[in-house]
Interface confidence: low
């Protein structure tokens, strides 16, 4: 609420009014007020509000009271001169009370031309015939923005899900300015997007930063007179390269005799980004290894022929031993067995010549 | 309060481009990200892409060869190409507003085209 | 790409039902996480974004809750013009994906 002074009767001046050399101002506040019927003391509807003059634009102050005989500024504690007041005055139908409103105009060269250690002010002052009442003070200030930012951001280069803090402090300020971050020209809404928060004192963390959070990012400080942008500070989102499993082991690659055996692996679970590191260590194995050699089958020498048999035959064998097939080595080709007629020994008859039988052994 | 409207031929032949373009209304075409959104008759939403005002864009990887997503900021409208179309591109196809960053969410959608594919 | 699963494929309800729709993400989406109500031949209708945010104009029976994989959205007394179909969409990362839909239905 505001500061009500009452003053009773005529005595409108408090501690704080030094006067004013506008003496014929002063003859036009009544002396007496006439005290039938009795009215209340005036009640501000509406007060003066701070203000800010903004470039060399000047600045409306407003008040409204009700019952008010008479309604007047006063800045810096001395009066304002009538002529720079504008009232109107009307009778609230509901109450039957006199409703008075009046404003006046500030101009930056009256700010710019206070001397001394407090801001400038402006309150209102109304009478009825109970007294005054004072408004509070309503200060008003030449709006203001430095260009450059106490403290502007860094960029960052963090790993995935790393807390990110990007600082902020905005230029100095009258009004004091307010504080947004921007993500790639967009308005970073940290209830839209619970990733970011932004402190108050402006600074912006990311959480978690993901993927997504590489971007530019930008501060910027706004009041009523100016908007600043900060310098970019860009944050990279990078992620380290991480190995993936091994392979089998793939065959030997010798196919007789020592050789090698190979594993590998790739850096690519996750696969290294945005300037992440390439995963240490080796991509491929390799240890020795021995495939035994082939060894084709031989024939041994033929064996002497058998005595002729009793079915006027013999024969004679050899063997695939010499050597024999080892480790995947061919097999010897051709008989293992000869026979042919024969008509010594144990035959029973006498036969022609015949055509050789052969015998494959199996 | 902000307005989006689809626009293009409602039948394509196989093979052929099919090209819409969205017409935002009532709001700037800045500082959002403008998104295609498809649904095939009887079937779920499919996102084909986005892009900002300021030219950059995000295709679905499974379209992206075929897709062409452009923006013209002085009419602020945006675009769809979608190359060599079939039969399965046949779909209501919905132009939306993505509040804020690319977090999205689509907050404002157009009434959606049908676009037929056939010959 | 992130797959979006939504159960109930298909729910009967009645006015006056709390009714309970579920999404499962298949990797964490932290709450990047919007539901969309859609009535036939109608564009969808933005309900909740970021897992549990109301959207400006939605009715306060309607809410959202969940983080990482798991989302619930959940109707608390459903109403005649709530028979629609609803759908999750995740906006954690590119391509965006959507739920394959919840058709809410008159018991």
């Known amino acids: 609420g505001s500061h009500h002074h009452h003053h009773h009767g005529s005595d409108y001046k408090d501690d704080d009014d030094k006067g004013s050399q506008d003496d014929e101002f002063f003859h036009e506040l009544p002396e007496t007020f006439p005290s039938d019927p009795p009215e209340p003391l005036p009640h501000f509807l509406i007060e003066p509000e701070e203000a800010y003059i903004v470039k060399n634009k000047p600045v409306n102050l407003y008040c409204k009271a009700s019952p008010a005989t008479q309604i007047y500024f006063k800045c810096n504690s001395e009066w304002v001169h009538q002529k720079d007041h504008v009232v109107d005055e009307r009778v609230d139908e509901t109450s039957g009370l006199i409703v008075r409103e009046v404003s006046i105009e500030i101009s930056r060269q009256q700010v710019e031309e206070l001397f001394g250690p407090e801001d400038y002010w402006c309150q209102c002052v109304a009478w009825s015939s109970a007294g005054t009442t004072k408004s509070r003070k309503a200060y008003v200030r030449i709006a203001y923005l430095r260009k450059t930012f106490e403290q502007e951001p860094l960029g960052k280069e963090v790993s995935l899900e790393q807390e990110v803090l990007l600082q902020c402090r905005p230029p100095e300020g009258i009004p004091v300015a307010e504080v947004e971050w921007l993500k790639n020209e967009d308005i970073i809404d940290p209830a839209e997007d619970r990733n970011f928060y932004i402190t108050i004192d402006h600074n912006l963390i990311i959480k978690q930063a993901r993927l997504s959070d590489t971007a530019n990012y930008t501060c910027v400080a706004k009041n009523i007179v100016a908007k600043r942008k900060s310098t970019t500070a860009t944050v990279i989102v990078y992620v380290n390269g991480g190995w993936s499993t091994w392979t089998e082991w793939s065959v030997c690659n010798s196919r007789c005799g020592r050789g090698y055996q190979k594993r590998t692996r790739t850096c690519t679970n996750p696969a290294p980004l945005n300037g992440g590191a390439f995963c240490e260590g080796q991509s491929v194995q390799k240890i020795a290894c021995t495939t035994l050699c082939p060894v084709d089958g031989r024939w041994t020498s033929w064996s002497k022929w058998s005595t002729c048999g009793t079915e006027c035959t013999h024969w004679r064998r050899r063997e695939c031993t010499a050597p024999a097939p080892k480790n995947g080595g061919k097999d010897c080709d051709g008989l293992v067995l000869q026979s042919k007629n024969c008509t010594d020994g144990l035959c029973m008859q006498a036969a022609p010549d015949s055509d050789d039988v052969a015998l494959y052994g199996s | 309060q902000v307005q989006l409207q689809e626009s293009g031929p409602g039948l394509v032949k196989p093979s052929e481009t099919l090209s819409l373009t969205c017409t935002v209304s009532?709001?700037?075409?800045?500082?959002?990200?403008w998104s295609w959104i498809r649904q095939p008759p009887g079937k779920g939403l499919e996102w084909i892409g986005y892009?900002?005002?300021?030219?950059?864009?995000n295709q679905n990887p499974s379209l992206k060869s075929r897709v062409t997503i452009s923006v013209d900021t002085s009419k602020n409208q945006f675009s769809l190409k979608l190359s060599s179309v079939t039969a399965a591109d046949t779909a209501v196809y919905y132009c939306a507003r993505g509040r804020g960053m690319a977090t999205l969410p689509f907050d404002y959608w157009g009434q959606g085209t049908l676009v037929t594919v056939s010959s | 790409d992130i797959q979006m699963t939504q159960s109930p494929s298909s729910l009967s309800a009645s006015v006056g039902d709390r009714v309970t729709i579920t999404c499962r993400a298949s990797?964490?989406?932290?709450?990047?996480l919007n539901w969309y109500q859609q009535k036939p031949g109608k564009a969808p209708k933005l309900l909740i974004y970021a897992a549990s945010s109301l959207q400006s104009g939605v009715p306060s029976r309607f809410s959202g809750s969940g983080s990482g994989t798991d989302f619930t959205l959940t109707i608390s007394s459903l109403q005649p013009e709530d028979f629609a179909t609803y759908y999750c969409?995740?906006?954690?990362?590119?391509?965006?994906?959507f739920g394959g839909g919840t058709k809410v239905e008159i018991k």
């Open positions: 969409q995740q906006s954690y990362s590119t391509p965006l994906t």
């Open positions: 990797q964490s989406i932290s709450s990047y």
């Open positions: 009532g709001g700037s075409i800045s500082s959002y990200f």
């Open positions: 892009i900002h005002n300021s030219g950059t864009t």
